[in-house]
């Protein structure tokens, strides 16, 4: 089966690479605009230049194109802890990231939030913090992992998942309680 192509892809596939089919005359292939520019006017005829203009401040195109408008530059989202790694240029969007000792958590494909890397107090670093992943901690005996922090087994309630990890401690606590009642 041939995959369904959108109108624009269909039109482009008729022309060689780096060119697109004239929207009013499908016998003409116009040269695409370079990155950092956008299409102001289609080429008037075969072998004639496409009228491309440079993107204005605050906008960009990152690849060759025949867009009628440049794309708006992204803004780093301060409320998500994001910082600007590199500013927008005519041919590259803003690059946002996190501060040192932080990692990105993606809530969706195009939204991330910065969080502090876990320090693994009362545990050891199993895997170091990376750009898109928090530190992986292994907890010392008598501690269990909750929300990526090593928490004392004295905070483990029987209904929680920690019971398996903390079972000896729970039994001990129960034992001392029982012995105190005699």
């Amino acid at each position: 089966l041939v995959p369904h192509l959108g109108d624009r892809e269909k039109r482009d596939s008729v022309c060689p690479q780096g060119k697109y089919i004239h929207p009013q005359n499908n016998s003409i292939c116009c040269t695409k605009c370079h990155k950092g520019t956008y299409l102001y006017n289609d080429c008037p005829g075969p072998g004639q230049d496409t009228d491309c203009r440079e993107c204005e401040s605050g906008s960009f195109t990152a690849s060759e194109n025949h867009l009628r408008h440049c794309l708006s530059c992204s803004k780093c989202r301060k409320e998500m802890g994001q910082v600007e790694i590199s500013s927008c240029t005519v041919d590259r969007d803003t690059v946002c990231g996190c501060r040192k000792n932080q990692y990105r958590h993606y809530w969706s494909e195009n939204l991330f939030q910065c969080f502090n890397c876990s320090l693994c107090l009362n545990g050891t670093v199993h895997l170091s913090c990376q750009e898109k992943q928090n530190t992986v901690c292994t907890c010392h005996a008598g501690f269990f992992l909750r929300e990526n922090e090593c928490v004392s087994c004295s905070n483990c309630k029987k209904s929680l998942e920690c019971t398996k990890l903390c079972l000896p401690q729970i039994e001990n606590v129960k034992g001392t309680e029982d012995s105190g009642t005699t």
Partner: nanobody, 119 residues
Framework: EVQLLESGGGLVQAGGSLRLSCAAS????????MVWVRQAPGKGLEWVSH????????FYADSVKGRFTISRDNSKNTLYLQMNSLRAEDTAVYHC????????????WGQGTLVTVSS
């Protein structure tokens, strides 16, 4: 004690509109970024929209962009979600939440309000 109480859900036909509200208490609402998330039947949580404390430059998931509008009234400690041109795929329980601070989980979020869109 933080409390978030959603309302405004219901049954609506495809193409229709609903306005969800979230009444907040127990914290300084005007200082917090607020979030709408949703959970469709049998699916995981999806981030719908969020709005910073000053109400400027809200974020929308691609799936709702141009159809949903988030807003807030800091004097009433209330968050809103205006939902227009509703689709069957918008059917979900909608929760309002405080933007997480310590890690990628929701410490504070409401019980939710069910939105059902019939096609």
């Amino acid at each position: 004690e933080v409390q978030l109480l959603e309302s405004g859900g219901g049954l609506v036909q495809a193409g229709g509109s609903l306005r969800l509200s979230c009444a907040a208490s127990g914290f300084t609402f005007a200082h917090e970024t607020m979030v709408w998330v949703r959970q469709a039947p049998g699916k995981g949580l999806e981030w719908v929209s969020h709005i910073p404390p000053d109400g400027q430059d809200p974020f929308y998931a691609d799936s709702v962009k141009g159809r949903f509008t988030i807003s807030r009234d800091n004097s009433k400690n209330t968050l809103y979600l205006q939902m227009n041109s509703l689709r069957a795929e918008d059917t979900a329980v909608y929760h309002c939440a405080l933007l997480p601070k310590r890690g990628p989980w929701f410490d504070y979020w409401g019980q939710g309000t069910l939105v059902t869109v019939s096609s």
